[in-house]
Amino acid sequence: QPDAINAPVTCCYNFTNRKISVQRLASYRRITSSKCPKEAVIFKTIVAKEICADPKQKWVQDSMDHLDKQTQTPKT
């Protein structure tokens, strides 16, 4: 779970140890603040649960790519 000590900076201290299927995902945000101990990705699920993940892991990168592709509005 992400932890906001001094809002609005949210940090992750532990990463999920299980791969989250893309069907469960709604969005993500990157955590890059120097106030946090490590870079992280926070996935938000379709039932509004927030899950910290390691951006170095391939499944995390693949999931972000997948969300990015499907979120893009096609140009007409």
């Epitope: 893309v22 469960r24 709604a26 969005s27 509004a48 499907q70």
Partner: antibody
Framework: QVQLLESGAELVRPGSSVKISCKAS????????MHWVKQRPGQGLEWIGW????????EYAPKFQGKATMTADTSSNTAYMQLSGLTSEDSAVYYC???????????????WGQGTTVT | DIVMTQSPLSLPVTLGQPASISCKSS???????????LNWLQQRPGQSPKRLIY???KLDSGVPDRFSGSGSGTDFTLKISRVEAEDVGVYYC?????????FGQGTKLEIK
């Protein structure tokens, strides 16, 4: 072919409990959240809650806390919902469903069971 | 809970004519992640509900492109460009931004 097959109609006594099932085929329930929705005769839809079949996590709408209990068995790819302390207010069709905004390839999906009538 | 108010509740339409259903929420459905979790369902007589539209305007697979969704914040619209006989049923808006998820009371579309 993706399908959610719910158990048959139930006729129950006031004060008793009933457990209805929702068997999935064509996909793995552990990759999804399973939801339950109530529809009283001639009425609208009410969301009951969801279960994460992978770890058993649940979340219930406040109205259904203590009334509904959701479980899942990943080995049989089946979700269950037990309703307790039944009254006439619980007479309804209950639907299981699963949905996503971002599927595995081309956008979202949503699947619904055929509904279980509890009288 | 977020209240979803649909209008009209009954919508008689002539075949081939357009139809429009409004859905208003008691609070903004714009989430902190910048997305708006507003969906539309169709329930034909005697059938289970079926999702038509998600994230305000995205059409589910297999849904005819005569259906479209639009809106933002608290005001949303489902449009059918040319109503066909198979469109008869009840249409619900459904929000997933705020807990608990809630549905509109439904709009019954019938053929005049």
């Amino acid at each position: 072919q993706v399908q959610l097959l719910e158990s048959g109609a139930e006729l129950v006594r006031p004060g008793s409990s009933v457990k209805i099932s929702c068997k999935a085929s064509g996909f793995n329930i552990k990759d999804n959240y399973m939801h339950w929705v109530k529809q009283r005769p001639g009425q609208g839809l009410e969301w009951i809650g969801w279960i994460d079949p992978e770890n058993g996590d649940t979340e219930y709408a406040p109205k259904f806390q203590g009334k509904a209990t959701m479980t899942a068995d990943t080995s049989s790819n089946t979700a269950y919902m037990q309703l307790s302390g039944l009254t006439s207010e619980d007479s309804a069709v209950y639907y299981c469903n699963t949905w996503a905004y971002y599927g595995t390839s081309y956008g979202g999906f949503a699947y619904w069971g055929q509904g279980t009538t509890v009288t | 809970d977020i209240v979803m108010t649909q209008s009209p509740l009954s919508l008689p339409v002539t075949l081939g004519q357009p139809a429009s259903i409004s859905c208003k929420s008691s609070q903004s459905l714009l989430d902190s992640d910048g997305k708006t979790y507003l969906n539309w369902l169709q329930q034909r007589p005697g059938q289970s509900p079926k999702r038509l539209i998600y994230l305000v305007s995205k059409l589910d697979s297999g849904v005819p492109d005569r259906f479209s969704g639009s809106g933002s914040g608290t005001d949303f619209t489902l449009k059918i460009s040319r109503v066909e006989a198979e469109d008869v049923g009840v249409y619900y808006c459904w929000q997933g931004t705020h807990f608990p998820q809630t549905f509109g009371q439904g709009t019954k579309l019938e053929i005049k």
